[in-house]
Interface confidence: low
């Protein structure tokens, strides 16, 4: 069953997805698609990474985390009701049928006419599972690759908190672990 996330029309939606590269810069291809994960690949691809960088993206869809460290969470900018639906995050681990597939359900709510100034956006559910590997995770990023790491437009406050605070690590650590190799 899908994990559910919510956002309001006009806001940014955040769909978390993580894995841990086996070594710094040793990236696993990832695709994001609109629709449930099919047997292979992603349907209706909106963003794709390869072994070195983001190599395909479409307007309004960005990676807001450090994808070189395995944070391949998707931000959808300025959502509309049409963005509602299932999204597939597929970690394309080498080998036959090794891919990890996460189906995330995005529910878009109409914007409130007069939102309370202190109200935070309503995101629900825990993070999806996190892939990890034996041994040590990647070292702190300095410059791991020959390309800029990230594209980001107006990321939501909550997404910033998730990425920047200890809460993010706590949530990641609480996820089910899958070991590769």
């Amino acid at each position: 069953s899908e994990v559910e996330y919510r956002a309001e029309v006009g806001q940014n939606a955040y769909l978390p997805c993580f894995y841990t590269p086996a070594a710094p810069g040793n990236l696993v291809p990832v695709c994001w698609g609109k629709g449930a994960c099919p047997v292979f690949e992603c349907g209706n691809v909106v963003l794709r990474t390869d072994e070195r960088d983001v190599n395909y993206w479409t307007s309004r869809y960005w990676l807001n985390g450090d994808f070189r460290k395995g944070d391949v969470s998707l931000t959808i900018e300025n959502v509309t009701l049409a963005d509602s639906g299932i999204y597939c995050c597929r970690i394309q681990i080498p080998g036959i049928m090794n891919d990890e597939k996460f189906n995330l359900k995005l529910v878009i709510k109409p914007a409130k006419v007069t939102p309370a100034p202190t109200r935070q956006r309503d995101f629900t559910a825990a993070f999806p599972r996190m892939l990890t590997t034996r041994g040590h995770g990647p070292a702190e990023t300095q410059t791991l690759g020959s390309l800029p790491d990230i594209n980001l437009t107006q990321i939501s406050t909550l997404a910033n908190e998730l990425r920047d605070s200890r809460l993010a690590n706590d949530l990641r650590d609480s996820g089910a672990t899958i070991r590769i190799g």
Epitope: D53, V54, N55, Y56, W57, N64, G65, D66, E140, T141, Q142, T143, S146, L147, P148, D149, I150, N151, L152, T153, Q154, I155, N160
Partner: antibody
Framework: QIQLVQSGPELKKPGETVRISCKAS????????MQWVQKMPGRGLKWIGW????????KYAEDFKGRFALSLETSATTAYLQISNLKNEDTATYFC?????????WGQGTSVTVSS | ENVLTQSPAIMSASPGEKVTMTCRAS???????LHWYQQKSGASPKLWIY???NLPSGVPARFSGSGSGTFYSLTVSSVESEDAATYYC?????????FGGGTKLEIK
Amino acid sequence: QIQLVQSGPELKKPGETVRISCKASGYTFRTAEMQWVQKMPGRGLKWIGWINTRSGVPKYAEDFKGRFALSLETSATTAYLQISNLKNEDTATYFCTRGTYAMDYWGQGTSVTVSS
Amino acid sequence: ENVLTQSPAIMSASPGEKVTMTCRASSIVSSSYLHWYQQKSGASPKLWIYSTSNLPSGVPARFSGSGSGTFYSLTVSSVESEDAATYYCQQYSGYPYTFGGGTKLEIK
């Protein structure tokens, strides 16, 4: 909305130092590299280098190693380009640009004139 | 370094004409990392086409891009006066990131 606002024009003498600022707003500063590009009068665009806004680590094109230095003031969401020991041939307009998958947002440019 | 050579350096067209400018790389560029920028006189460059053929929002649909390997092109299907500008190709495939010398499009 995303904006990169650069400091104003500079008139300098050879041998002096100039520091150009680039104030970013409308996005989370440390999630996108900041690139710098030079445009000399009557010439094309030339990539100077970029700085990783999380680690502060810069990378320079070969032609700009030495006298050109990129730095950050992360708390102020501001990137800097400093050129020391200015030469007449540094006369140009310098642009900061958010270096993401492509250079999608640009500052308005800072004109630097070096003349004795 | 990967040298990008644009041609022609200057081109002139009448409104309604179709124009094509090219960008040739000295070594292979992944189509994902070949971009085009538009710069009008006295203004900052703007990302005009990304990843060979994708148009950012706000760029008119009369612009298109194509190519692969070492040869890329930008086409305007029906030139308008507002298209007068210099267009630069740029590659992100490896250091240093390089720009072509630019093609200046003049409108008659």
